[in-house]
Every structure is written in structure tokens, then in C-alpha cells.
Interface confidence: low
């Protein structure tokens, strides 16, 4: 699996989309998990409704929400009030029995809010080498940006 990079601004919301084949994954619940290390386990953050027919209902775990368009084949995860510690590697998963298929590997990057000096010390270097083949970026800033527009908050 290639890794898709989603970038969001600290303090704002980030929306991650995971497209999938709706026929292949018909009847399967979905989940969003956080990868613990490059080869470590993927820790479940939130999953869709226990009843697959109600997968369209948004479910929350803390500041993370999940909803599934089972007809269109798009799983959507919302990270509300994004923080530097939310940065890292995640997976969208399709569940069947005790198994889980990876729909998409996602790298969440957090762009710091320049006016929030409290977070200035929370920017991190990775503790170990990471390698992602053919990663590409999806800018998912929570408000629409015009070409070349800067998402820095205005200075007073």
C-alpha cells in the first residue's frame, strides 16, 4: 500500500477520506487505527456502527469521528481540533471476522498555528527512520484555500 499524506492546521479540523470498492467490501464494518511504529500493531481509534446498515451514522471517540458511505464506497474520518501529537501513521481498515484489510495507509501531518506559541515546543523529530514508497500529499485544510492563499491566521 502506498501512503497518502493529509495535512491539517493545528486547532482546526482535518478530514481524511478512504475510497474503497463498495462491492468487494459490502457488509463489512470499517475502522480507523493508529500505527504503533513502522511494523508494530495498529491500535483501534474508532470504528463504524455495530450494525452495518447504520454505518452512515457518525461515531465519535474523543475528537475523532468516523462515517461510512457504503454505497459510494468512501470512509471518512474527521480529526477535530487537530494537535501536533495527532501527527503519525494511521490506517483505514475493512473488518471481516477477526481479520482486517487495509484500505489506505495515511500519514497525518500537522501544520503549526504560528500564533499558538504554546505548541511551539510540541513539534517533533521522528524517533526512528520511516520509509514510505510513493507517498503523495492531499492537502485537507479545513477551510477552502484559493491558489497560493496562506492558511496563517491574520496577525492583529
Amino acid at each position: 500500500h502506498n501512503t497518502t499524506v493529509f495535512q491539517g492546521v493545528a486547532g482546526q479540523s482535518l478530514q481524511v477520506s478512504c475510497p474503497y470498492d463498495s462491492m468487494k467490501h459490502w457488509g463489512r464494518r470499517k475502522a480507523w487505527c493508529r500505527q504503533l511504529g513502522e511494523k508494530g500493531p495498529c491500535q483501534r481509534v474508532v470504528s463504524t456502527h455495530n450494525l452495518w446498515l447504520l454505518s452512515f451514522l457518525r461515531r465519535w471517540n474523543g475528537s475523532t469521528a468516523i462515517t461510512d458511505d457504503t454505497l459510494g464506497g468512501t470512509l471518512t474520518i474527521t480529526l477535530r481540533n487537530l494537535q501536533p501529537h495527532d501527527a503519525g501513521l494511521y490506517q483505514c481498515q475493512s473488518l471481516h471476522g477477526s481479520e482486517a484489510d487495509t484500505l489506505r495507509k495515511v500519514l497525518v501531518e500537522v501544520l503549526a498555528d504560528p500564533l499558538d506559541h504554546r505548541d511551539a515546543g510540541d513539534l517533533w523529530f521522528p524517533g526512528e527512520s520511516e520509509s514510505f514508497e510513493d507517498a503523495h500529499v492531499e492537502h485537507s485544510i479545513s477551510r477552502s484555500l484559493l491558489e497560493g492563499e496562506i492558511p496563517f491566521p491574520p496577525t492583529s
Epitope: 500519514l107 501531518e109 501544520l111 517533533w124 524517533g127 526512528e128 527512520s129
Partner: nanobody, 112 residues
């Protein structure tokens, strides 16, 4: 970080930052600065991959340019038309989970 020094107002400097220990091209990079008795300030951001996403603080817009060379694991800050208020220690950094590490920074002094 390197490339700092003493420069007169209106002058230019190019700062360099060498990164290692991670897949550099996949990460957003930042330049920060910290002047004496002031908070650390985010100056510029460059996105991952081709670095087409760039972002600047209002105070440096039009004067500073951030760029990156993924093949060399380098990020640069070209600073033109420098002003005395640009005097600070400049740091580069990356957003990711791990251990906090700011490096030593590089001193930029703008004075006549």
C-alpha cells in the same frame, strides 16, 4: 542549521538545514526563529514531496523564501532585504511524533 551571521540592513543570507534519520521527503518542514526575550516564532513552512506548498508569516512575506532539496535532505531559507527586527536564532524543524529536538540553531544578526 547553518548560514547565519552578521549582515547589514537590506542585506541577504541563506540558511541551510540538514536532516537525517527519517524519510525527509515525506514531511512538512518549518523554519522558526527566537529573538532574545521573545517567544519562538514560526517563520515559514514547506510541504512534503515537491515542496509546492509554502507558507510565510506576515512579517517576512515577500522577503523570505523557503525551499527544499529532497535528494540532499536539505531545507533552505533565503532571506532578502533583512531588517534589524529579523535578528534572532533560526531553527528548522519537522512535525512528527518522536522526541523533541530543536538543534542548536543559527544566529542571524542584522545591524549597521
Amino acid at each position: 542549521e547553518s548560514g547565519g551571521g552578521l549582515v547589514q540592513p537590506g542585506g541577504s543570507l541563506r540558511l541551510s538545514c540538514a536532516a537525517s534519520g527519517f524519510a525527509f521527503g515525506n514531511y512538512v518542514m518549518h523554519w522558526y526563529r527566537q529573538a532574545p526575550e521573545k517567544e519562538r516564532e514560526l517563520v515559514a513552512i514547506i510541504g512534503s514531496q515537491g515542496g509546492t506548498y509554502t507558507n510565510y508569516a506576515d512579517s517576512v512575506k515577500g522577503r523570505f523564501t523557503i525551499s527544499r532539496d529532497n535528494a540532499k535532505n536539505m531545507v533552505y531559507l533565503q532571506m532578502n532585504n533583512l531588517k534589524p527586527e529579523d535578528t534572532a536564532v533560526y531553527y528548522c524543524n519537522v512535525v512528527y511524533i518522536g522526541r523533541p529536538n530543536w538543534g542548536q540553531g543559527t544566529q542571524v544578526t542584522v545591524s549597521s
